[in-house]
Interface confidence: low
């Protein structure tokens, strides 16, 4: 008599989450009589998946009609697969008995569930950093299976190499998570830059998922300050300008000090953006030199994005300008500024 064979032709089956999985099993003989049962796992802790003889298994249906006597196909279809269904499935022939006696098991079919990774979420540093500093960006994606996954980092289309990636858990699991931290060196031109975390996985059919972060959230470009004096005007007033250039973000406060005393404070707002994403701002003061005996020390003090103030000073040489008797009267009467210093910004 030919020995009974339980044949599971596929060693492994891979199914996308949500799809149905077909697990094939045929037997070489219907003798001896007895049921076929499907289990996930082996040994005493195995889980009954389907019993052709009895029970209620709503997600499992037989591929062929098991009630037909000549049917030797005991394949099943499991619907709406989730990552929790992953495992090795065994088709097992029992001989009728009390209890039924296990005769032979198939070799097993490993069901792997392809679950798409979640959209990568890229998070940047909590505080801004300046050019030449290195900042870290973290990318996380969850819920994928199988474990094999590729993660790449790009900055403006150029692939980055300084990153560390971990896939958890290390052992077998129904689904996995990936976390990667990239180190990016900032440059002054990075206001418009983007970092992209690209995740490639078998479930994505070659169309990787991308998460992005704008370096504008991570970078601080400190301003350049330049204080200059325009040529003397006919009315004995000197125009002193403070040019604040190439800064980001826009949050900036400018204070004019005259001989150490606060003259005017301004806040930057609604500035036009430079091509590189930075901002420029010019503030000016009119100094009535005839109202002063001594040289006037003007200081342009800039506080950018909550950082310590940066100063640039300039001395208006009163001695270099001839005094005109009574020339300051009109200026004083304007009531604009007791110190005969007037200003604006643009």
């Amino acid at each position: 008599e030919e020995e009974l064979q339980v044949i599971q032709p596929e060693k492994s089956v891979s199914v996308a989450a949500g799809d149905s999985a077909t697990l094939n099993c045929t037997v070489s003989s219907l003798i001896p009589v007895g049921p076929i049962q499907w289990f996930r796992g082996a040994g005493p802790g195995r889980e009954l998946i389907y019993n052709l003889k009895e029970g209620h298994f709503p997600r499992v249906t037989p591929v062929s009609d098991p009630t037909k006597r000549n049917n030797m196909d005991f394949s099943i279809r499991i619907s709406n697969i989730t990552p929790a269904d992953a495992g090795t499935y065994y088709c097992v022939k029992f001989r009728k008995g009390s209890p039924d006696v296990e005769l032979k098991s198939g070799a097993g079919t490993e069901l792997s569930v392809r679950a798409k990774p979640s959209a990568p979420v890229v998070s940047g540093p909590a505080v801004r950093a300046t050019a030449e500093h290195t900042v870290s960006f973290t990318c996380e994606s969850h819920g994928f299976s199988p474990r094999d996954i590729t993660l790449k980092w790009f900055k403006n289309g150029n692939e980055l190499s300084d990153f560390q990636t971990n896939v958890d858990p290390a052992g077998k699991s129904v689904s996995y998570s990936i976390r990667s931290t990239a180190r990016v060196v900032l440059t002054r031109r990075d206001v418009h830059s983007q970092v992209i975390c690209e995740v490639a996985h078998v479930t994505l059919q070659g169309d990787p998922l991308r998460g992005t972060a704008n370096l504008s959230e991570a970078i601080r470009v400190p301003p350049f300050l330049e204080v200059t004096q325009q040529s003397m005007r006919a009315d004995n007033q000197v125009n002193v300008t403070c040019q604040v250039t190439k800064f980001y973000p826009q949050r900036l406060q400018l204070t004019w000090l005259e001989n150490g005393n606060v003259s005017r404070t301004e806040m930057a707002s609604a500035l036009p953006e430079n091509k590189d994403g930075t901002y420029n701002w010019t503030s000016w003061l009119l100094v009535n030199v005839s109202a002063h005996r001594d040289d006037v020390k003007l200081t342009c003090q800039v506080e950018h994005d909550g950082q310590p103030a940066v100063n640039k000073s300039f001395s208006v040489k009163v001695s270099a300008h001839p005094k005109e008797q009574g020339s300051n009267t009109a200026a004083e009467n304007t009531g604009t500024n007791e110190r005969n210093i007037y200003g604006g910004s643009g």
């Epitope: 289309g157 440059t187 830059s193 091509k275």
Partner: antibody, heavy 118, light 107 residues
Framework: EVQLVESGGGLVQPGGSLRLSCAAS????????MHWVRQAPGKGLEWVSA???????YYTGSVKGRFTISRENAKNSLYLQMNSLRAEDTAVYYC????????????WGQGTMVTVSS | DIQMTQSPSSLSASVGDRVTITCRAS??????AAWFQQKPGKAPKSLIY???SLHSGVPSKFSGSGSGTDFTLTISSLQPEDFATYYC?????????FGQGTKLEIK
């Protein structure tokens, strides 16, 4: 006026070396990505090399290990050191400035001719 | 490397004509496509960047369009000074690559 002026081209034997220079004026070279592009006689344009603002360097496959791009900020100049020259390196070499934020080429030099022949 | 395939390789047209040159990238390059004009014995001149933006000083008769893999350069009304060779380029990733060129000749 923003300008790029290349120099250093000439006739060199196969296996020889040459150093191309590109003098920039009207802008600060170190603030831009800078490139070398070449054009063999009667042929199309070929990107050769680039140097980023952070000093990162890039090369086309055929020149890797033979050419070195560098810049000298104090002189506002870009260089291309070409070693182990081959006949197929014969071309006009252009110095090109990349745009401020997307690196699109905006300013080209007039080019310098390099001839590799025995 | 990303290949840029330009067509046609040569084109005859008359003054006043509207001409279109196309360029196809071997993979998606977003809109990082540029167009250049080159006259014999001269350095190339930058015309268009990010597929459709005109460099300063470039007349508005030049226009570009496209995204992903397919790009076009259109010259709305040809003038004698427009007869030259035109190149497309991708600059999304190194190595940057150019199309083989389209020679625009007077008919």
């Amino acid at each position: 006026e923003v300008q790029l002026v290349e120099s250093g081209g000439g006739l060199v034997q196969p296996g020889g070396s040459l150093r191309l220079s590109c003098a920039a004026s009207g802008f600060t070279l170190s603030s831009y990505d800078m490139h070398w592009v070449r054009q063999a006689p009667g042929k199309g344009l070929e990107w050769v090399s680039a140097i980023g603002t952070a000093g990162d360097t890039y090369y086309t496959g055929s020149v890797k290990g033979r050419f070195t791009i560098s810049r000298e900020n104090a002189k506002n100049s870009l260089y291309l050191q070409m070693n182990s020259l081959r006949a197929e390196d014969t071309a006009v070499y252009y110095c090109v400035r990349g745009g401020v934020w997307d690196d699109a080429f905006d300013i080209w030099g007039q080019g310098t001719m390099v001839t590799v022949s025995s | 490397d990303i290949q840029m395939t330009q067509s046609p390789s040569s084109l005859s047209a008359s003054v006043g004509d509207r001409v279109t040159i196309t360029c196809r990238a071997s993979q998606g390059i977003n809109n990082y496509a540029a167009w250049f004009q080159q006259k014999p014995g001269k350095a190339p001149k930058s015309l268009i960047y990010t597929a459709s933006s005109l460099h300063s000083g470039v007349p508005s008769k030049f226009s570009g369009s496209g995204s992903g893999t397919d790009f076009t350069l259109t010259i709305s009304s040809l003038q004698p000074e427009d007869f030259a060779t035109y190149y497309c380029q991708q600059y999304v990733s190194y190595p940057y690559t150019f199309g083989q060129g389209t020679k625009l000749e007077i008919k």
